[in-house]
């Protein structure tokens, strides 16, 4: 089934995430809160009134307000999750779909340069779908994915900033670059 009403949620590999149920408040009428991982149609956590809370494994934690915590996210946690909330008569009073997408956090970008041909490189080694941005003295120069190579001509000294980011993280590096007049390393 194509999910049109899913809440897109981003999590960082190795980190924890809370899937919070929007506009839901626990009440005495609530009899059952059930979380399912829909790829294998499997129940992963469940609260039932006057019953022990069920969790399929220890990486899941279900809070009293219905929030599901997934600990130490792994790539196979990327999935579509469904939470269904039922009253004492079995009525489905609230249902939400979460499209959980997982990314590796970006590493700090590395800036290197050579004065011989006034070329600067910014590179990010780790991270899912990183976006690199290069700035010279506060002015945006280039946008790329993993590597930016830039040849500068305006002046031999400049402050370069390189930022790497994705949906779950952001890192930056700043380097004041100064080259001698004759363009020697």
């Amino acid at each position: 089934k194509e999910i049109t009403n899913a809440l897109e949620t981003w999590g960082a590999l190795g980190q924890d995430i809370n899937l919070d149920i929007p506009s839901f408040q626990m009440s005495d009428d609530i009899d059952d809160i059930k979380w399912e991982k829909t790829s294998d149609k499997k129940k992963i956590a469940q609260f039932r009134k006057e019953k022990e809370t069920f969790k399929e494994k220890d990486t899941y934690k279900l809070f009293k307000n219905g929030t599901l915590k997934i600990k130490h996210l792994k790539t196979d946690d990327q999935d579509i999750y469904k939470v269904s909330i039922y009253d004492t008569k079995g009525k489905n009073v609230l249902e939400k779909i979460f499209d959980l997408k997982i990314q590796e956090r970006v590493s700090k970008p590395k800036i290197s340069w050579t004065c011989i041909n006034t070329t600067l490189t910014c590179e990010v080694m780790n991270g899912t779908d990183p976006e690199l941005n290069l700035y010279q003295d506060g002015k945006h120069l280039k946008l790329s994915q993993r590597v930016i190579t830039h040849k500068w001509t305006t002046s031999l000294s400049a402050k370069f900033k390189c930022t790497a980011g994705n949906k779950v993280s952001k890192e930056s590096s700043v380097e004041p670059v100064s080259c001698p007049e004759k363009g020697l390393d």
């Epitope: 059952d32 059930k34 149609k41 499997k42 069920f54 469904k82 269904s84 039922y86 079995g90 489905n92």
Partner: antibody, heavy 117, light 107 residues
């Protein structure tokens, strides 16, 4: 009083298609999860399809890709579109209203599907 | 899928008898076990949910017990109208699966 009435069954050739309907009354249809369950000629009960109150569907592997379950909350009606039918699909098809954990609280009277050449 | 096994396949009893119907799951399903009664030419009817919870309108002679993988449906004092097939169903995960049934006959 909760009522569920199935219709649309009949005799179909293998490879053919058919659409079953289930008219619901006596309850807030849009707020309940619904399912189709079938009973084979050998009297075995098998789950066919599930749809949540919000329209999310699950199918067992036996019918996945061939059957499509949908609901029209304005008409209080559940639909089961079946295609690429096989002789193994021959059964009595029941529409049912379920609770939180797959308990089938109310059942219709059923409609018969026969797949045969 | 979870396999549900019911025994015996057929049970022949005398009115007034106390009977026990067994249902076993191929893995633990906690108390997510539901019982149904199906009379000849009728739709199944929910008797017991969550292994032991009674259902409104069902006579009190029907009761359920068990947890994990072994479950029992008890009929305290069988009446002639209790003839039919009794089915158990796993309610833990999808697809919910049914047992093959126990046919209750009156001698």
């Amino acid at each position: 009083e909760v009522q569920l009435e199935e219709s649309g069954g009949g005799l179909v050739m293998p490879g053919g298609s058919l659409k079953l309907s289930c008219a619901a009354s006596g309850f807030a249809f849009s707020s309940y999860d619904m399912s189709w369950v079938r009973q084979t000629p050998e009297k075995r009960l098998e789950w066919v399809a599930y749809i949540s109150g919000g329209g999310f569907t699950y199918y067992p592997d036996t019918v996945k890709g061939r059957f499509t379950l949908s609901r029209d909350n304005a008409k209080n009606t559940l639909y089961l579109q079946m295609s690429s039918l096989k002789s193994e699909d021959t059964a009595m098809y029941y529409c049912a209203r379920q609770g939180a954990n797959w308990e089938l609280v109310y059942w219709g009277q059923g409609t018969t599907l026969t797949v045969s050449s | 899928d979870i396999v549900m096994t019911q025994s015996p396949a057929t049970l022949s009893v005398t009115p007034g008898d106390r009977v026990f119907l067994s249902c076993r799951a191929s893995q633990s399903i906690s108390d997510f076990l539901h019982w149904y009664q199906q009379k000849s030419h009728e739709s199944p009817r929910l008797l017991i949910k969550y292994a032991s919870q009674s259902i409104s309108g069902i006579p009190s002679r029907f009761s359920g017990s068990g947890s994990g993988s072994d479950f029992t449906l008890s009929i305290n004092s069988v009446e002639p109208e209790d003839v039919g097939v009794y089915l158990c169903q796993n309610g833990h995960n999808f697809p919910p699966t049914f047992g093959g049934g126990t046919k209750l006959e009156i001698k």
